[in-house]
């Protein structure tokens, strides 16, 4: 039990950063825990995420990765990573096709535990100045390029 007035020690030594990606590209979020063997959960809008053709979940030692494949405007919004009692929120912002390059034909994906399908190889930019929100999206405004804020 932490002393009154003192924040509990975060389970994360590296927190995911909010990013901005072109529609059709993958978005990759990384977190590092203080030690290996820590069970990590990822969420979107408070809803748990499980591995699928859409979501790649990988763990190597202390490094935990969430890959959101072929992002579309509907993927824009608030995400979180949870380890123990530590929860860190971060955001995904999607730049629509008319503001970015169109989706590329699927290319061979790097090997991943969940067997990723082809992904358009486009880098995710750390979130800086906010661009206009995609039409029809009711996601909240995004933070700047700082690691996600803890929400313990």
């Amino acid at each position: 039990m932490p002393e009154p007035g003192k924040k509990p020690v975060s389970a994360f030594s590296k927190k995911p950063r909010s990013v901005e990606v072109a529609a059709g590209s993958p978005a990759v979020f990384e977190a590092e825990t203080e030690r290996a063997g820590v069970k990590v959960r990822w969420q979107r809008g408070g809803s748990d995420i499980s591995a699928s053709n859409k979501y790649g979940l990988a763990t190597e030692g202390t490094r935990h990765t969430l890959t959101v494949r072929e992002v579309g405007p509907a993927d824009q919004g608030s995400y979180a990573v949870i380890a123990g009692s530590s929860k860190v929120k971060f955001d995904l912002k999607v730049i629509e096709a008319e503001k970015a390059e169109p989706m590329l034909a699927p290319a061979p994906a790097p090997a991943e535990a969940t067997g990723a399908p082809g992904e358009a190889p486009a880098p995710a930019a750390e979130l800086g100045e906010s661009a206009p929100s995609p039409k029809g999206s009711s996601s909240a405004a995004l933070n700047g390029p700082t690691p996600g804020a803890p929400d313990d």
Epitope: G24, Q43, R44, G45, G46, S47, D48, I49, S50, A51, S52, N53, K54, Y55, R69, E70, G72, P73, A74, G77, S78, A97, P102, M103, P117, P134, K135, G136, S137, S138, A140
Partner: antibody, heavy 118, light 107 residues
């Protein structure tokens, strides 16, 4: 096992509002999103909106001005309220769980039939 | 909104035949596409998510392919219990939209 069950009024007068409850079991609403989808008689499926685990919502812009989705996690219930109903709102209304592997809908209720008529 | 166009509207088959359903999106949606089956007087049932990933408990005779704008659902040997309506749905952008459906009927 995962179950969703809708309950509604059956008959609604034109210009009145519609309230439907979706009661779920086998999973917690804090960790899953729930969608609302409707199907007019003899026609296809139409997505109305959804509520996320954290209570945030996304709506079909066509209905956003007269649609509200909310929930009570402790009662495992999700609520749909639609105002100003017209005869073309006659449909079967379904609630469906959002798949944790993405935005598909993995489990559906049996639906509740709503007729808008005077 | 993204328009999902399904063809044909009706497919007539004999048991044991291989059948293909087509769904075309009005814009590139990657693989953000799902297939559902709805039997008469029943609720929709998820068959395939993200174009090609079979949902748990779905018979192996169902498969999905496609990416971008063109998608296909196949049943490699139709059984009588497969007689139903089939819908595609995109989750690339809000609002989520469904195709008008293809009705599978017996010859």
């Amino acid at each position: 096992q995962v179950q969703l069950k809708e309950s509604g009024p059956g008959l609604v007068a034109p210009s009145q509002s519609l309230s439907i409850t979706c009661t779920v079991s086998g999973f917690s609403l804090t960790g899953y999103g729930v969608n609302w989808v409707r199907q007019p008689p003899g026609k296809g499926l139409e997505w109305l909106g959804m509520i996320w685990g954290d209570g945030s919502t996304d709506y079909n812009s066509v209905y956003k001005s007269r649609l509200s989705i909310s929930k009570d996690n402790s009662k495992s219930q999700v609520f749909l309220k639609m105002n100003s109903l017209q005869t073309d709102d006659t449909a079967r209304y379904y609630c469906a769980r959002r798949d944790t592997g993405g935005a598909s809908m993995d489990y559906w209720g049996q639906g509740t039939s709503v007729t808008v008529s005077s | 909104d993204i328009l999902m166009t399904q063809s044909p509207a009706i497919l007539s088959v004999s048991p044991g035949e291989r059948v293909s359903f087509s769904c075309r999106a009005s814009q590139n949606i990657g693989t953000n596409m799902h297939w559902y089956q709805q039997r008469t007087n029943g609720s929709p049932r998820l068959l395939i998510r993200f174009a090609s990933e079979s949902f748990s408990g779905i018979p192996s005779r169902f498969s999905g392919t496609g990416s971008g704008t063109d998608f296909t659902l196949r049943i490699n040997s139709v059984e009588s219990e497969d007689i139903a309506d089939y819908y595609c749905q995109q989750s690339y952008n809000w609002p989520f939209t469904f195709g008008a459906g293809t009705k599978l009927e017996l010859k």
